[in-house]
Protein backbone atom coordinates (compact mmCIF):
# COMPACT_ATOMS: atom_id res chain seq x y z
CA UNK A 1 0.00 0.00 0.00
CA UNK A 2 1.36 3.44 -0.87
CA UNK A 3 2.16 5.89 1.88
CA UNK A 4 1.30 9.57 2.02
CA UNK A 5 4.18 11.97 1.49
CA UNK A 6 3.75 13.15 5.09
CA UNK A 7 5.71 10.11 6.29
CA UNK A 8 8.96 12.03 6.15
CA UNK A 9 11.36 13.63 8.60
CA UNK A 10 14.06 16.07 7.63
CA UNK A 11 17.58 14.63 7.81
CA UNK A 12 18.56 17.51 10.11
CA UNK A 13 16.52 15.91 12.92
CA UNK A 14 19.12 13.16 13.08
CA UNK A 15 22.19 15.33 12.58
CA UNK A 16 22.19 17.08 15.95
CA UNK A 17 25.21 15.63 17.78
CA UNK A 18 24.13 16.70 21.27
CA UNK A 19 20.65 15.17 21.34
CA UNK A 20 21.83 12.13 19.38
CA UNK A 21 24.50 11.56 22.03
CA UNK A 22 21.98 12.04 24.86
CA UNK A 23 19.59 9.55 23.24
CA UNK A 24 22.34 6.95 22.98
CA UNK A 25 23.53 7.65 26.55
CA UNK A 26 19.98 7.15 27.83
CA UNK A 27 19.69 3.88 25.93
CA UNK A 28 23.04 2.69 27.29
CA UNK A 29 22.16 3.51 30.88
CA UNK A 30 18.79 1.77 30.65
CA UNK A 31 20.27 -1.27 28.93
CA UNK A 32 22.62 -1.72 31.89
CA UNK A 33 19.50 -2.12 34.03
CA UNK A 34 17.94 -4.60 31.57
CA UNK A 35 18.54 -8.16 32.74
CA UNK A 36 16.45 -9.81 30.01
CA UNK A 37 18.87 -10.07 27.10
CA UNK A 38 16.95 -12.87 25.34
CA UNK A 39 14.13 -10.59 24.19
CA UNK A 40 14.52 -7.95 21.47
CA UNK A 41 11.77 -5.42 20.79
CA UNK A 42 13.20 -3.62 17.75
CA UNK A 43 14.62 -6.20 15.40
CA UNK A 44 13.91 -8.07 12.19
CA UNK A 45 10.55 -9.41 13.30
CA UNK A 46 9.14 -5.93 13.83
CA UNK A 47 9.43 -5.44 10.07
CA UNK A 48 8.10 -8.86 9.00
CA UNK A 49 5.87 -8.43 5.96
CA UNK A 50 6.28 -4.64 5.98
CA UNK A 51 7.73 -3.10 2.83
CA UNK A 52 10.53 -0.58 3.23
CA UNK A 53 8.27 2.27 2.11
CA UNK A 54 5.75 1.42 4.87
CA UNK A 55 8.27 1.38 7.69
CA UNK A 56 8.16 5.07 8.61
CA UNK A 57 4.47 4.62 9.39
CA UNK A 58 5.31 1.53 11.46
CA UNK A 59 8.04 3.38 13.35
CA UNK A 60 5.64 6.25 14.02
CA UNK A 61 3.38 3.75 15.81
CA UNK A 62 6.32 2.38 17.81
CA UNK A 63 7.48 5.90 18.70
CA UNK A 64 4.02 6.95 19.90
CA UNK A 65 3.65 3.82 22.03
CA UNK A 66 7.13 4.29 23.49
CA UNK A 67 6.37 7.89 24.43
CA UNK A 68 2.91 7.33 25.87
CA UNK A 69 3.31 3.97 27.56
CA UNK A 70 7.00 3.92 28.47
CA UNK A 71 8.78 7.27 28.54
CA UNK A 72 6.07 9.42 30.11
CA UNK A 73 5.41 6.92 32.94
CA UNK A 74 9.16 6.49 33.53
CA UNK A 75 10.00 10.19 33.12
CA UNK A 76 11.53 10.50 36.60
CA UNK A 77 14.13 7.79 35.83
CA UNK A 78 17.51 8.02 34.09
CA UNK A 79 18.06 11.73 34.59
CA UNK A 80 19.34 14.03 33.22
CA UNK A 81 19.01 12.26 29.87
CA UNK A 82 15.28 11.59 30.07
CA UNK A 83 14.28 15.25 30.43
CA UNK A 84 16.17 16.11 27.24
CA UNK A 85 15.38 13.08 25.10
CA UNK A 86 11.63 12.89 25.73
CA UNK A 87 10.86 16.37 24.32
CA UNK A 88 13.06 15.61 21.30
CA UNK A 89 11.20 12.37 20.56
CA UNK A 90 7.87 14.11 21.20
CA UNK A 91 8.78 16.67 18.54
CA UNK A 92 9.51 13.88 16.07
CA UNK A 93 6.17 12.30 16.92
CA UNK A 94 4.42 15.62 16.35
CA UNK A 95 6.11 16.01 12.95
CA UNK A 96 4.83 12.56 11.99
CA UNK A 97 1.27 13.27 13.15
CA UNK A 98 0.02 13.56 9.56
CA UNK A 99 1.81 10.36 8.47
CA UNK A 100 -0.86 7.89 7.37
CA UNK A 101 -1.01 4.83 5.17
CA UNK A 102 -3.41 4.39 2.29
CA UNK A 103 -5.26 1.10 2.46
CA UNK A 104 -5.03 -1.76 4.90
CA UNK A 105 -2.49 -1.41 7.72
CA UNK A 106 -3.48 -4.59 9.57
CA UNK A 107 -0.11 -6.24 8.92
CA UNK A 108 1.62 -3.24 10.48
CA UNK A 109 -0.72 -3.04 13.48
CA UNK A 110 -0.18 -6.76 14.09
CA UNK A 111 3.59 -6.30 14.32
CA UNK A 112 3.30 -3.24 16.55
CA UNK A 113 0.82 -5.07 18.78
CA UNK A 114 3.33 -7.89 19.30
CA UNK A 115 5.87 -5.33 20.50
CA UNK A 116 3.28 -3.74 22.81
CA UNK A 117 2.25 -7.14 24.18
CA UNK A 118 5.88 -8.04 24.90
CA UNK A 119 6.47 -4.79 26.80
CA UNK A 120 3.24 -5.22 28.78
CA UNK A 121 3.99 -8.86 29.57
CA UNK A 122 7.42 -7.97 30.95
CA UNK A 123 5.98 -5.16 33.09
CA UNK A 124 8.47 -2.61 34.34
CA UNK A 125 11.40 -4.60 32.95
CA UNK A 126 9.72 -4.34 29.55
CA UNK A 127 9.62 -0.58 29.89
CA UNK A 128 13.31 -0.52 30.86
CA UNK A 129 14.07 -2.69 27.82
CA UNK A 130 12.19 -0.27 25.55
CA UNK A 131 14.25 2.62 26.95
CA UNK A 132 17.40 0.55 26.45
CA UNK A 133 16.48 0.20 22.77
CA UNK A 134 16.02 3.92 22.15
CA UNK A 135 19.21 3.83 20.08
CA UNK A 136 17.57 1.25 17.79
CA UNK A 137 14.36 3.31 17.73
CA UNK A 138 16.37 6.39 16.77
CA UNK A 139 18.27 4.59 13.99
CA UNK A 140 15.16 2.88 12.65
CA UNK A 141 13.26 6.18 12.55
CA UNK A 142 16.18 7.75 10.71
CA UNK A 143 16.42 4.90 8.21
CA UNK A 144 12.67 4.76 7.65
CA UNK A 145 11.69 8.40 7.58
CA UNK A 146 14.41 10.48 5.95
Amino acid sequence: APISSHCRLDKSNFQQPYITNRTFMLAKEASLADNNTDVRLIGEKLFHGVSMSERCYLMKQVLNFTLEEVLFPQSDRFQPYMQEVVPFLARLSNRLSTCHIEGDDLHIQRNVQKLKDTVKKLGESGEIKAIGELDLLFMSLRNACI
Partner: antibody
Protein backbone atom coordinates in the same frame (compact mmCIF):
# COMPACT_ATOMS: atom_id res chain seq x y z
CA UNK B 1 35.31 -11.68 8.88
CA UNK B 2 31.87 -12.51 7.46
CA UNK B 3 31.97 -15.56 5.19
CA UNK B 4 29.37 -17.75 3.49
CA UNK B 5 30.13 -20.96 1.61
CA UNK B 6 27.62 -22.95 -0.45
CA UNK B 7 28.05 -26.69 -0.92
CA UNK B 8 26.14 -29.57 -2.43
CA UNK B 9 26.08 -32.02 -5.35
CA UNK B 10 26.90 -30.45 -8.69
CA UNK B 11 24.64 -32.86 -10.57
CA UNK B 12 21.03 -33.72 -9.78
CA UNK B 13 18.70 -35.97 -11.79
CA UNK B 14 15.35 -34.62 -13.03
CA UNK B 15 12.42 -35.13 -10.60
CA UNK B 16 14.84 -35.53 -7.68
CA UNK B 17 15.44 -33.10 -4.81
CA UNK B 18 18.23 -30.55 -4.94
CA UNK B 19 19.88 -30.13 -1.53
CA UNK B 20 22.34 -27.35 -0.76
CA UNK B 21 24.00 -26.12 2.41
CA UNK B 22 25.28 -22.65 3.27
CA UNK B 23 27.91 -22.68 6.02
CA UNK B 24 28.50 -19.29 7.61
CA UNK B 25 31.15 -17.76 9.86
CA UNK B 26 31.81 -14.35 11.35
CA UNK B 27 28.20 -13.79 12.42
CA UNK B 28 25.33 -15.52 14.18
CA UNK B 29 22.34 -16.98 12.35
CA UNK B 30 20.22 -15.79 15.28
CA UNK B 31 21.15 -12.17 14.52
CA UNK B 32 20.98 -11.97 10.71
CA UNK B 33 18.87 -13.31 7.88
CA UNK B 34 20.31 -15.52 5.17
CA UNK B 35 18.84 -15.40 1.65
CA UNK B 36 19.10 -17.82 -1.25
CA UNK B 37 19.46 -16.46 -4.80
CA UNK B 38 20.11 -18.28 -8.05
CA UNK B 39 21.43 -17.35 -11.49
CA UNK B 40 20.68 -19.26 -14.65
CA UNK B 41 23.60 -19.60 -17.09
CA UNK B 42 24.23 -16.23 -18.73
CA UNK B 43 21.14 -14.71 -17.08
CA UNK B 44 20.17 -12.41 -14.20
CA UNK B 45 19.65 -13.11 -10.52
CA UNK B 46 16.50 -14.62 -9.02
CA UNK B 47 15.57 -14.43 -5.33
CA UNK B 48 14.49 -17.82 -3.95
CA UNK B 49 13.78 -17.25 -0.27
CA UNK B 50 15.00 -16.28 3.15
CA UNK B 51 15.73 -17.71 6.57
CA UNK B 52 14.91 -15.12 9.25
CA UNK B 53 17.08 -14.69 12.33
CA UNK B 54 14.37 -16.26 14.51
CA UNK B 55 14.02 -19.34 12.29
CA UNK B 56 10.98 -18.22 10.30
CA UNK B 57 11.09 -18.38 6.50
CA UNK B 58 9.86 -16.35 3.53
CA UNK B 59 9.67 -17.90 0.05
CA UNK B 60 9.30 -16.58 -3.46
CA UNK B 61 5.81 -17.75 -4.46
CA UNK B 62 7.31 -19.14 -7.66
CA UNK B 63 8.99 -21.84 -5.52
CA UNK B 64 6.67 -22.22 -2.52
CA UNK B 65 5.20 -25.62 -3.40
CA UNK B 66 8.58 -27.34 -3.71
CA UNK B 67 10.92 -25.27 -1.52
CA UNK B 68 12.11 -25.83 2.03
CA UNK B 69 14.67 -23.63 3.77
CA UNK B 70 15.86 -24.72 7.21
CA UNK B 71 18.81 -24.16 9.52
CA UNK B 72 21.02 -25.77 12.13
CA UNK B 73 22.37 -23.01 14.36
CA UNK B 74 24.76 -25.39 16.15
CA UNK B 75 26.50 -26.04 12.83
CA UNK B 76 26.12 -22.47 11.51
CA UNK B 77 24.31 -23.85 8.48
CA UNK B 78 21.29 -22.90 6.39
CA UNK B 79 19.90 -25.51 4.02
CA UNK B 80 17.89 -25.29 0.83
CA UNK B 81 15.84 -28.17 -0.55
CA UNK B 82 14.11 -27.86 -3.92
CA UNK B 83 12.03 -30.86 -4.95
CA UNK B 84 10.90 -32.14 -8.36
CA UNK B 85 13.72 -30.40 -10.20
CA UNK B 86 13.84 -29.96 -13.96
CA UNK B 87 16.46 -28.66 -16.38
CA UNK B 88 15.08 -25.17 -15.66
CA UNK B 89 16.59 -25.43 -12.16
CA UNK B 90 20.12 -25.62 -13.59
CA UNK B 91 21.84 -22.56 -12.14
CA UNK B 92 24.48 -21.16 -9.84
CA UNK B 93 22.99 -21.00 -6.33
CA UNK B 94 24.12 -18.33 -3.87
CA UNK B 95 23.49 -17.69 -0.21
CA UNK B 96 23.79 -14.14 1.07
CA UNK B 97 23.52 -12.36 4.42
CA UNK B 98 21.34 -9.33 5.05
CA UNK B 99 23.01 -6.01 5.85
CA UNK B 100 21.42 -5.63 9.30
CA UNK B 101 18.11 -6.00 11.14
CA UNK B 102 16.64 -2.94 9.40
CA UNK B 103 18.05 -3.37 5.89
CA UNK B 104 17.04 -7.01 5.95
CA UNK B 105 16.29 -7.15 2.22
CA UNK B 106 19.71 -5.76 1.25
CA UNK B 107 22.23 -8.52 0.53
CA UNK B 108 25.51 -7.31 1.99
CA UNK B 109 27.66 -10.46 1.97
CA UNK B 110 27.55 -13.28 -0.60
CA UNK B 111 29.01 -16.71 -0.99
CA UNK B 112 30.88 -17.53 -4.20
CA UNK B 113 28.04 -19.74 -5.41
CA UNK B 114 27.75 -23.40 -6.28
CA UNK B 115 26.83 -24.68 -9.74
CA UNK B 116 24.00 -27.19 -9.96
CA UNK B 117 23.20 -29.01 -13.19
CA UNK B 118 19.97 -30.95 -13.58
CA UNK B 119 20.49 -33.75 -16.06
CA UNK B 120 19.90 -37.47 -16.37
CA UNK C 1 6.12 -8.98 -8.96
CA UNK C 2 8.07 -5.80 -9.65
CA UNK C 3 9.99 -5.99 -12.92
CA UNK C 4 13.41 -4.33 -13.00
CA UNK C 5 14.74 -3.23 -16.39
CA UNK C 6 18.39 -2.25 -16.78
CA UNK C 7 19.95 -0.39 -19.66
CA UNK C 8 22.15 -0.75 -21.51
CA UNK C 9 22.69 -4.51 -21.39
CA UNK C 10 26.35 -3.90 -22.17
CA UNK C 11 28.61 -0.88 -22.43
CA UNK C 12 32.21 -0.43 -23.62
CA UNK C 13 34.32 2.21 -21.92
CA UNK C 14 37.91 3.14 -21.15
CA UNK C 15 39.78 3.70 -17.91
CA UNK C 16 39.01 7.22 -16.68
CA UNK C 17 35.61 7.39 -18.41
CA UNK C 18 32.39 8.36 -16.65
CA UNK C 19 29.78 5.63 -16.98
CA UNK C 20 26.08 5.68 -16.17
CA UNK C 21 23.81 2.63 -15.91
CA UNK C 22 20.06 3.01 -15.52
CA UNK C 23 17.46 0.84 -13.84
CA UNK C 24 13.69 1.21 -14.16
CA UNK C 25 11.10 -0.40 -11.87
CA UNK C 26 7.66 -1.43 -13.14
CA UNK C 27 6.08 0.34 -10.15
CA UNK C 28 7.28 2.79 -7.54
CA UNK C 29 9.81 1.46 -5.04
CA UNK C 30 10.42 4.81 -3.31
CA UNK C 31 14.23 5.00 -2.85
CA UNK C 32 14.76 1.31 -2.16
CA UNK C 33 17.16 0.20 -4.85
CA UNK C 34 20.49 -1.60 -4.43
CA UNK C 35 23.37 -2.04 -6.87
CA UNK C 36 25.72 -5.04 -6.95
CA UNK C 37 28.96 -5.79 -8.78
CA UNK C 38 29.60 -9.29 -10.10
CA UNK C 39 32.96 -10.64 -11.24
CA UNK C 40 33.76 -14.22 -12.32
CA UNK C 41 35.13 -16.31 -9.47
CA UNK C 42 34.43 -13.62 -6.87
CA UNK C 43 31.62 -13.09 -4.41
CA UNK C 44 29.01 -10.54 -5.48
CA UNK C 45 29.61 -7.15 -3.90
CA UNK C 46 27.02 -4.71 -2.55
CA UNK C 47 27.85 -1.20 -3.77
CA UNK C 48 24.83 0.96 -2.96
CA UNK C 49 21.50 0.56 -1.16
CA UNK C 50 18.52 2.82 -0.53
CA UNK C 51 19.21 4.37 -3.91
CA UNK C 52 22.21 6.44 -2.87
CA UNK C 53 23.79 5.06 0.33
CA UNK C 54 27.32 3.88 -0.33
CA UNK C 55 28.13 0.57 1.34
CA UNK C 56 31.08 0.69 3.73
CA UNK C 57 34.40 0.20 1.94
CA UNK C 58 33.07 1.01 -1.53
CA UNK C 59 35.08 3.70 -3.37
CA UNK C 60 33.45 7.13 -3.65
CA UNK C 61 33.67 7.06 -7.46
CA UNK C 62 30.50 4.94 -7.26
CA UNK C 63 27.27 6.87 -6.70
CA UNK C 64 23.57 6.18 -6.99
CA UNK C 65 20.59 8.42 -7.52
CA UNK C 66 16.89 8.30 -8.27
CA UNK C 67 13.60 7.50 -6.60
CA UNK C 68 10.19 6.19 -7.54
CA UNK C 69 10.80 4.14 -10.68
CA UNK C 70 13.97 5.58 -12.26
CA UNK C 71 17.47 5.06 -10.88
CA UNK C 72 21.06 5.46 -12.02
CA UNK C 73 24.44 4.08 -11.02
CA UNK C 74 27.35 6.33 -11.95
CA UNK C 75 31.05 5.49 -11.93
CA UNK C 76 32.78 8.86 -12.12
CA UNK C 77 36.18 7.70 -13.31
CA UNK C 78 36.51 4.08 -14.36
CA UNK C 79 39.31 2.04 -12.84
CA UNK C 80 40.63 -1.26 -14.28
CA UNK C 81 38.98 -3.22 -11.45
CA UNK C 82 35.54 -1.79 -12.29
CA UNK C 83 35.09 -3.86 -15.44
CA UNK C 84 32.38 -6.30 -14.34
CA UNK C 85 28.64 -6.94 -14.55
CA UNK C 86 26.34 -4.70 -12.52
CA UNK C 87 22.88 -5.62 -11.21
CA UNK C 88 20.14 -3.50 -9.67
CA UNK C 89 17.74 -4.95 -7.10
CA UNK C 90 14.60 -3.52 -5.58
CA UNK C 91 14.67 -4.10 -1.83
CA UNK C 92 11.32 -2.51 -1.08
CA UNK C 93 9.07 -5.57 -1.07
CA UNK C 94 8.82 -9.31 -1.68
CA UNK C 95 9.70 -11.01 -3.85
CA UNK C 96 13.04 -9.26 -4.15
CA UNK C 97 13.72 -8.76 -7.85
CA UNK C 98 16.81 -7.96 -9.90
CA UNK C 99 17.58 -6.33 -13.21
CA UNK C 100 18.99 -8.49 -16.00
CA UNK C 101 22.47 -6.98 -15.61
CA UNK C 102 24.76 -4.57 -17.43
CA UNK C 103 28.13 -5.84 -18.60
CA UNK C 104 30.83 -3.16 -18.46
CA UNK C 105 33.60 -4.04 -20.91
CA UNK C 106 36.94 -2.51 -21.85
CA UNK C 107 36.79 -0.52 -25.08
Amino acid sequence: EVQLQESGPGLVKPSQTLSLTCTVSGFSLTSYSVHWVRQHPGKGLEWIGRMWSDGDTSYNTAFTSRLTISRDTSKNQVSLKLSSVTAADTAVYYCARSLDFYYDTTLAFWGQGTTVTVSS
Amino acid sequence: DIQMTQSPSSVSASVGDRVTITCKASKTISKYLAWYQQKPGKANKLLIYSGSTLQSGVPSRFSGSGSGTDFTLTISSLQPEDFATYYCQQHNEYPLTFGQGTKLEIK
